[in-house]
């Protein structure tokens, strides 16, 4: 059995979560990839996804989430800027591989966002966030919708303990429309 593990990040409001999801280059370089949140008792919900096929080093922004897929590195970079307390939750990267169910990239991210002063005198993280302002023109796109006969019987674990699961794939439902926009530096 494959173990589902979590990596925990405790950040302050206004900070940036910046993580990288590693994938097999030969299999998944051009596959569409997504960032999901897993809420208690619910199936994973897609918050943002890359183009289909996924474009190399082409930033995609959905609200405060920026995805960049680096084919040459075999890495999907996910940034959530200007974090809010309500962003706290369990997240994961997945790769879409229709008609099969999405393939989950380990490990899941347990994000805890707290109120409070995030910096020290001279801290300048906020200046970096100007880069990620949404341009006035946006393009509407849909991430794939996956349904499954399986139902969720319990919430994902809140601890960082390992949890056994039969495989490394998970299911998607309740995926809603998203706005996908280019990011200009």
């Amino acid at each position: 059995a494959t173990k589902l593990t979590e990596e925990k990040y405790e950040l302050k409001e206004g900070q940036t979560l910046d993580v990288k999801c590693d994938y097999t280059l030969e299999k998944f370089a051009s596959s569409q990839k997504a960032w999901q949140i897993i809420r208690d008792g619910e199936m994973p919900k897609t918050l943002a996804c890359t183009e289909r096929p996924s474009k190399n080093s082409h930033p995609v922004q959905v609200g405060r989430i920026i995805l960049e897929d680096y084919h040459d590195h075999g890495l999907l970079r996910v940034r959530m800027v200007n974090l809010q307390v309500e962003d706290s939750g369990l997240y994961q990267c997945v790769i879409y591989q229709p008609p099969k169910e999405p393939h989950m990239l380990f490990d899941r991210i347990r994000l805890v966002v707290t109120k409070g002063f995030s910096g020290t005198p001279g801290s300048n993280e906020n200046s970096t966030q100007n880069v990620y302002k949404i341009p006035p023109t946006t393009t509407k796109a849909l991430c794939p919708l996956y349904t499954s006969p399986r139902t969720v019987t319990q919430a994902p674990p809140k601890s960082t303990a390992d949890v056994s699961t039969p495989d490394s794939e998970i299911n998607l439902t309740n995926v809603t429309d998203i706005i996908r926009v280019p990011v200009f530096n």
């Epitope: 494959t2 173990k3 593990t5 990596e7 990040y9 405790e10 950040l11 302050k12 900070q15 940036t16 979560l17 910046d18 993580v19 990288k20 999801c21 590693d22 994938y23 097999t24 280059l25 040459d72 590195h73 075999g74 890495l75 990239l105 380990f106 490990d107 991210i109 995030s118 300048n124 993280e125 200046s127 970096t128």
Partner: antibody
Amino acid sequence: EVQLLESGGGLVQPGGSLRLSCAVSGFTFSRYAMSWVRQAPGKGLEWVSEMRGSSGSTYYADSVKGRFTISRDNSKNTLYLQMNSLRVEDTAIYYCAKEFSSNSLFDYWGQGTLVTVSS
Amino acid sequence: EIVMTQSPATLSVSPGERATLSCRASQSVNANLAWYQQKPGQAPRLLIYGASTRATGIPARFSGSGSGTEFTLTISSLQSEDFAVYYCQQFYNWPPWTFGQGTKVEIK
């Protein structure tokens, strides 16, 4: 329990070669990036090389590029560092380190193996 | 390459007192910063990552703060086992991953 055990260090002349090994246990080796980090006697930490887990991408510090090669054998749960054209300034304790899945920070370290380059 | 600069090089503190260590990055690394503790003859140990998240098993007296270019590691009440060298490391963007030169915390 996560364990990393380096071996292969020793005394070598300038221009010589060594191959370091790092045998790991306690986690799914193939899933995680691994790095080599070195520490010259009485000095600070210097990252040397990294190999990603799923992608297999490799990266090197400028100081070792073209001379060192990182590799891994997932079936043996072992990380390697082939060091060629060794220089006196490569003398250091070499640590292998497991990385987080989500970022290149080092949550588990081996005890280190000493490489001495001297004539 | 992102250069990490730690200060002071040496910090003399009495047991029970508070220690404050600083780390500065040559450019913004957001919250992509870790702190390690190293005792003589031992491998480094991860203390803090993501600028402020304590690693598994690290006592609450260790705390990290900061974002962007300025970071602080605070040890609220130094215990005898805390006297060691502390390193910061950035893991922003792509390699090379760089460490600060270290701060030695010694008994006053």
